[in-house]
């Protein structure tokens, strides 16, 4: 049974009975604010396998593990997130382990596990097997690992049952609880899921399956579910719905909402059943559930009751999806996030007009403002104190405003202000003045030439490539040696490269300051000989793949407060040579007579060029006598563990708890004072925690119904 659209269980633990028949929760699952400690052992929901949005647990007294409640929860899709997170476990006072031993995939979003005083078995879970990116996971304020003594199944008896992986250079066993290992699929399955018996599932399965290579036996679907089958796309006359299943027209027409009138019901557009026509489209007549393109602009006006809309997470940006005109002010304050640039573009990329001001501050996750890719007019009907309608303050990684060669932006009224944007070149700001028509409005202190761009190489020269050589998995490139006015200002070069099937990439594509960067980076030192041109060998590349490459000179950025010149190249597109293809897949042979074999196979996953033919070789095999000698029921004894070498952890025996090493001396001494940067980082961390906590409280505390 599909339950939804979102389930909120609060105050009374018996409300959990609402989950009794759910196999899929279409929407979110909240379990929260159950203050009386209860015995949850009689509550078990083995049918539940998928949550399409997110799972939030908050202040549920007496709950010690989620494993008994949701033994078969396999996938959290994260189609909609809770403040960038698909799994939130917050202030669960009695939770001892997560225990979701069948959880195999969180499709989108990160996890936040915070302030759970008794929670262990966090370091034993390898989240990289479940999530694509673990860098934005936030696991803080739980029971210290040293107090946990987490032991995976069998380790006490020296018969470990779990598999090992490496996290933070630590190779260890992976498990959810003292008796549940973390499931890992054989490497032969690649990105495919697998059964309990380690057989690979059908490619359309996600998480797990009950039978191998069968698209009707999936626990969850990688793409879409329709009539019992996992399909890569919805069949004709059916439509994608909520990111996971296919529904018919009648289904879509019969979705109701208490918030809107029936004339604003769901529509069908571009093969999807959705809440409203996307931007640029309008309903095809008053009683139609189909969308047609607008003639000219068809604005969707979004208004913020409180006048100023704060964008501090993907969730808050989600509220602006489809908006073309924003009536009010935008305050952008993005400190961190997963894949933030593309997520923000997804939700805010259609905004064309902001009637008030735009303020971007403390947005350390942003490298560029290009996510506002359609912004063309800031009216400045409301302005900040000092008559500012565009205000950019303290964005530590902001390097680009917009691509001014392809951008027309007008600021109708008000001034611009820029300060403490250390990677934003002043030339970029001056260019914005010209494009937006604000030149002459700003007074001297509005664009600070000292603290904008102070840590940037503000490029003005072009580096030219001199040669390129390719092999199947290598590219060798050289470029002209850059000569700044003072050769001592040139430190090194950085080469950026990435796969680029099409010649349409830009320097800031998919880039944010939180590690989401589609470019690989390699530093290149200056050749000692001044006459040798710098160059690099890029290796480990894929055969027959087009790469985009560009080079930047790394220069000293300040000389007595004057910005010095930097340099970078244009983007070069270059394809590696073809190579031997990988092995053909799924080779099957069957005999249909005493003198014939029929052999079938699928193309290789990596053709490494244009395939022209296959070579099939065969030979008669003698039967191997060894096959009969080996006892396949016996398991070879595997060395289990490395024993301790007799040394004792200093921290456990020293009298003085302050054991940091200061200066050149070894041994206990006082902790070094924190640097300003560390203090600032701690302050920001605390602030970020507060922002999340406020968001959580604002989201879940609602007035009691009358």
């Amino acid at each position: 049974e599909i339950c939804g659209p979102g389930i909120d269980i609060r105050n009374d633990y018996q409300q959990l009975k609402r989950l009794e028949n759910c196999t899929v929760i279409e929407g979110y699952l909240h379990i929260l604010l159950i203050s009386k400690a209860e015995d949850y052992r009689s509550y078990r929901f083995p049918k539940l396998t998928v949550i399409t949005e997110y799972l939030l647990l908050f202040r549920v007294a007496g709950l010690e593990s989620l494993g008994d409640l949701f033994p078969n929860l396999t996938v959290i899709r994260g189609w909609k997130l809770f403040y960038n997170y698909a799994l939130v476990i917050f202030e669960m006072t009695n939770l001892k382990d997560i225990g979701l031993y069948n959880l195999r995939n969180i499709t989108r979003g990160a996890i936040r596990i915070e302030k759970n005083a008794d929670l262990c078995y966090l370091s034993t879970v390898d989240w990289s097997l479940i999530l694509d990116a673990v860098s934005n996971n936030y696991i803080v304020g739980n029971k210290p690992p040293k107090e946990c003594g987490d032991l995976c199944p069998g380790t006490m008896e020296e018969k470990p049952m779990c598999e090992k992986t490496t996290i933070n250079n630590e190779y260890n066993y992976r498990c959810w609880t003292t008796n549940r290992c973390q499931k890992m699929c054989p490497s032969t399955c690649g990105k495919r899921a697998c059964t309990e018996n380690n057989e690979c599932c059908h490619p359309e399965c996600l998480g797990s399956c009950s039978a191998p290579d069968n698209d009707t036996a999936c626990v969850a679907c990688r793409h879409y579910y329709y009539a019992g089958v996992c399909v890569p796309a919805c069949p004709p006359n059916t439509y994608r719905f909520e990111g996971w299943r296919c529904v018919d027209r009648d289904f879509c027409a019969n979705i109701l909402s208490a918030e809107s009138s029936d004339s604003e019901g769901f529509v069908i557009h571009d093969g999807e059943c959705m809440q409203e026509c996307p931007s640029g489209f309008i309903r095809n007549g008053s009683q139609s559930m189909y969308c047609i393109p607008c003639e000219g602009p068809c604005p969707k006006v979004c208004e913020e009751e409180k006048k100023t809309k704060t964008i501090d997470s993907v969730t808050s940006a989600q509220m602006l999806q489809g908006c073309t005109i924003f009536k009010g002010n935008l305050l952008i304050n993005i400190r961190r996030g997963n894949n933030i640039a593309s997520e923000l573009e997804n939700f805010m990329g259609l905004i064309e007009v902001v009637t008030g001001y735009v303020k971007i501050r403390h947005s350390h996750a942003l490298v560029s403002l290009s996510f506002l890719k359609n912004l063309r007019l800031i009216l400045g009907e409301e302005q900040l104190e000092g008559n500012y309608s565009f205000y950019v303050l303290d964005n530590q990684n902001l390097q680009q405003l917009w691509d001014w060669d392809h951008r027309n932006l007008t600021i109708k009224a008000g001034k611009m202000y820029f300060a403490f944007n250390p990677k934003l070149c002043v030339s970029e700001i001056y260019r914005m003045e010209e494009v937006t028509g604000t030149k002459g409005r700003q007074s001297k202190g509005d664009i600070n030439t000292r603290n904008n761009g102070e840590r940037a190489s503000c490029e003005s020269d072009v580096l030219h490539f001199t040669s390129t050589t390719t092999s199947k998995n290598r590219i060798i490139i050289t470029w002209h040696r850059y000569r700044p006015p003072d050769y001592r200002d040139l430190i090194s070069f950085t080469v950026y490269y990435k796969e680029a099937p099409f010649k349409n990439v830009t320097e800031y594509d998919g880039q944010d300051a939180c590690g989401s960067n589609s470019w690989n980076m390699v530093d290149v030192d200056l050749p000692p000989n001044k006459d040798v041109e710098p160059g690099i060998l890029l290796h480990g590349l894929k055969p027959w793949t087009q790469y985009a490459v560009y080079v930047k000179a790394v220069t000293l950025t300040m000389v007595e407060n004057d910005h010095i010149r930097g340099a970078k190249s244009e983007i070069l597109y270059i394809r590696t040579n073809a190579s031997v293809p990988s092995i053909p897949l799924d080779v099957l042979s069957a005999s249909n007579s005493s003198s014939q074999l029929i052999v079938k196979w699928n193309p290789p996953s990596l053709p490494n060029g244009n395939l022209s033919y296959y070579i099939v070789r065969w030979q008669r095999q003698p039967q191997d006598g060894y096959l009969y000698r080996h006892n396949y029921c016996s398991k070879d004894k595997i060395p289990i563990r490395k024993y301790a070498d007799g040394t004792i952890d200093i921290e456990e025996v020293t009298e003085n708890p302050k054991t940091e090493v200061c200066g050149g001396e070894k041994g206990p001494c006082c902790a070094c004072p924190k640097t300003e940067a560390e203090k600032q980082a701690e302050k920001e961390e605390a602030e970020y925690r507060k922002v999340f906590e406020n968001f959580l409280h604002n989201s879940i505390f609602v007035p009691r119904p009358e």
Epitope: F251, A258, S261
Partner: antibody, heavy 118, light 107 residues
Framework: EVQLVQSGGGLVKPGGSLRLSCAAS????????MHWVRQAPGKGLEWISV???????YYADSVKGRFTISRDNAKNSLYLQMNSLRAEDTAVYYC????????????WGQGTTVTVSS | EIVLTQSPGTLSVSPGERATLSCRAS??????LHWYQQKPGQAPRLLIK???QSLSGIPDRFSGSGSGTDFTLTISRLEPEDFAVYYC?????????FGQGTKVEIK
């Protein structure tokens, strides 16, 4: 033929419970929102509840907290669980597939009588 | 919730005459108003949907008009089988609501 067949009515004491059922045939049940409407003796029609295709449920204030609408798409069935029944809940109860904003004819069940009396 | 008020409560008309029934909504409901006919012991029967759209199988002497808050059902020439109770129903906003009904009786 599109039809809805109701069952489960009867006499019940105040405070008691009753479960009404409605079996659908002749159309793709899971693709339609389903309603319950009642009519007290000699009175007008009163809309009481709906369950949409996602399983979202909505109720009239007069029954909120006491009645629960549910559906079993595998069995093509609609249910109304009525708890804490009162004398004023005495009525003929109809299950209905009402047309929506976009298109569609109504389909009504034959009605089933619920009498709440001590 | 949206309140629908029907008038008159009872309408006495002779067969062959014209009958005009009114339904007023407490707030704008666009065209999301539907008219039903109900005879004793029977389930309601839909006559007009979305204020003015006629349905197949319904005699064309039944017509509807209006939008927003004021709606009218007109029966151009009353036939003996038309004497019944008529209800308006709004589906614009949840919870759905019905009017209290207009009884059309033989004069």
């Amino acid at each position: 033929e599109v039809q809805l067949v109701q069952s489960g009515g009867g006499l019940v004491k105040p405070g008691g419970s009753l479960r009404l059922s409605c079996a659908a045939s002749g159309f793709t049940f899971s693709s339609f929102a389903m309603h319950w409407v009642r009519q007290a003796p000699g009175k007008g029609l009163e809309w009481i509840s709906v369950i949409d295709t996602r399983g979202a449920t909505y109720y009239a204030d007069s029954v909120k907290g006491r009645f629960t609408i549910s559906r079993d798409n595998a069995k093509n069935s609609l249910y109304l669980q009525m708890n804490s029944l009162r004398a004023e809940d005495t009525a003929v109860y109809y299950c209905a597939r009402l047309g929506n904003f976009y298109y569609g004819h109504d389909v009504w069940g034959q009605g089933t009588t619920v009498t709440v009396s001590s | 919730e949206i309140v629908l008020t029907q008038s008159p409560g009872t309408l006495s008309v002779s067969p062959g005459e014209r009958a005009t029934l009114s339904c007023r909504a407490s707030q704008s409901i666009g065209s999301s108003l539907h008219w039903y006919q109900q005879k004793p012991g029977q389930a309601p029967r839909l006559l007009i949907k979305h204020a003015s759209q006629s349905l197949s199988g319904i005699p064309d002497r039944f017509s509807g008009s209006g939008s927003g808050t004021d709606f009218t059902l007109t029966i151009s020439r009353l036939e003996p089988e038309d004497f019944a109770v008529y209800y308006c129903h709004q589906s614009s906003r949840l919870p759905h609501t019905f009017g209290q009904g207009t009884k059309v009786e033989i004069k």
